[in-house]
């Protein structure tokens, strides 16, 4: 599907001192979506402001979000889902900035859960797998996912691939023997809806085998 | 009150090209994307691609690649619509037209008719 | 490409009648409640103008004799009591896949 900013990509910063981000949640809680927005300037004193929405919502013209502690948010079966909202940051009734955006446009999955990874030593493969919450959801029911792995000594040196579904193999002969592997993953929108990457999930930590010296393969642990 | 003025009628000979116009007015030209709908002469409509002002960023019909180029002026609130070796079966009227969300279009230009005639 | 088809090609009805135009869709263009399915009128010389969005929302400005309805691959256009200034072709669109498609129109006349 054609789009216009790249998936991940946060609206523009506005030009001025209140510029926000946003992202959007659907049925994040039973048949409730949620909106989150936020200052991008930690600095900002947010002590008087508030947040509006208006536009493409069933039944009311507009909504006030809730403030908890920095960030700002919405619980509520009432968004349209098509049509640009008007999201701005007041002071009592006067408007200091606002943006028009398509609430299907910055959706934020949910992150992935329960991955694991499982040695097949017969097959000298790695199995691994994970669930998400979006396999019984209505909307965003298609992602991808970004699995990354690295040898637990190698600070930054990530591997990622990206997968469809929830199952992803690993050679043996990929990974360095009788080594310990963090693995995590995290997910993106990716039919219709755009957005950005879900938070990662908890890690997941593996050893591979020794290598056996008489058949030069890795023993199991 | 919102708006979409497109330049005038065209004709120009196969093998040109012919650049359309259309400016925006009465709202924040950076809020919506803006796209382009040809009509052939007693035909229906088509969709040829649009563009997002905020960012320059393109989307085209599979159809018009390579034929179209989209392309927007934030200071003057217009967006052009480029199309390159013309020939007889590009005559039509050509509409810009605002998205009001993902992709419906609730403002249309008047129409540009291009007429492509050796 | 979601092929569009529109049915009837054209429509002649009385003055205070009811006019059902539908559209069928080669493959659903609904996402749960979601129906990415929109109606245009044109008349003679003009630019389409949009009357519903999402399937069953009015756009602002339209008399509310117009309606949609429908889910997935089949919906309905319905001009409850047809007036003489609702003479137009009508389209429908789809916005779930690029590209955006568009029915083959449907022709309101007065009988």
């Known amino acids: 599907e054609s789009g216009y900013a790249q998936n991940g990509d946060l609206e523009d910063a506005e030009l001025d001192d209140y510029s926000f981000s946003c992202y959007s949640q659907l049925e994040v809680n039973g048949s409730q979506h949620s909106l989150t927005c936020a200052f991008e300037d930690p600095d900002v004193n947010i002590t008087n402001l508030e947040f509006e929405i208006c536009g493409a919502l069933v039944e009311v013209k507009c909504l006030n979000f809730r403030k908890l502690q920095e960030i700002y948010f919405i619980e509520t079966k009432k968004f349209l889902l098509i049509g640009k909202s008007n999201i701005c940051v007041k002071v009592g009734e006067k408007s200091l900035t606002c943006k028009k955006i398509d609430l299907t446009t910055i959706v934020k999955p949910e992150a992935p859960f329960d991955l694991s990874v499982v040695y097949r030593e017969g097959a000298n493969d790695f199995v691994v797998t994970f669930n998400t919450s979006h396999l019984q959801k209505k909307y965003v029911k298609v992602l991808m996912h970004d699995v990354a792995y690295r040898q637990e000594k190698d600070e930054n040196k990530w591997t990622h691939v990206n997968l469809s579904s929830t199952k992803l193999t690993l050679l043996q002969r990929k990974l360095q023997p009788a080594a310990m592997y963090e693995i995590k993953v995290r997910s993106i929108p990716d039919h219709y809806f755009k957005g950005f990457w879900s938070e990662w999930s908890p890690s997941y930590y593996f050893r591979t085998p020794e290598i056996n010296n008489s058949s030069g393969e890795m023993d199991p642990i | 009150q919102v708006q979409l003025v497109q330049s005038g009628a065209e004709v120009k000979k196969p093998g040109a090209s012919v650049k359309v116009s259309c400016k925006a007015s009465?709202?924040?030209?950076?809020?919506?994307?803006l796209h382009w709908v040809r009509q052939a002469p007693g035909q229906g409509l088509e969709w040829m691609g649009g563009?997002?002002?905020?960012?320059?960023?393109?989307a085209y019909n599979q159809k018009f690649k390579g034929k179209v180029t989209l392309t927007s002026d934030r200071s003057t609130s217009t967006v052009y619509m480029e199309l390159s070796s013309l020939r007889s079966e590009d005559t039509a009227v050509y509409y810009c037209?605002?998205?009001?969300?993902?992709?419906?279009?609730?403002?249309w230009g008047q129409g540009t008719t291009v007429t492509v005639s050796s | 490409d979601i092929v569009m088809t529109q049915s009837p090609d054209s429509l002649a009805v009385s003055l205070g009648e009811r006019a059902t135009i539908n559209c069928r869709t080669s493959?659903?263009?609904?996402?749960?409640?979601?129906?990415?399915m929109h109606w245009y009128q044109q008349k003679p010389g003009q630019p389409p103008k949009l009357l519903i969005y999402?399937?069953?929302n009015l756009e602002s400005g339209v008399p509310d004799r117009f309606s949609g309805s429908g889910s997935g691959t089949d919906f309905t256009l319905t001009i409850s009591s047809l007036q003489a200034e609702d003479v137009a072709v009508y389209y429908c669109?789809?916005?779930?896949?690029?590209?955006?498609?568009f029915g083959g129109g449907t022709k309101v006349e007065i009988k």
């Open positions: 493959e659903s263009v609904s996402i749960h409640l979601l129906h990415l």
């Open positions: 669109q789809q916005s779930i896949k690029d590209p955006y498609t």
């Open positions: 999402g399937a069953s």
């Open positions: 009465g709202y924040r030209f950076t809020d919506y994307e």
């Open positions: 037209a605002r998205s009001g969300g993902r992709w419906y279009f609730d403002v």
């Open positions: 563009i997002d002002p905020k960012t320059g960023g393109t």
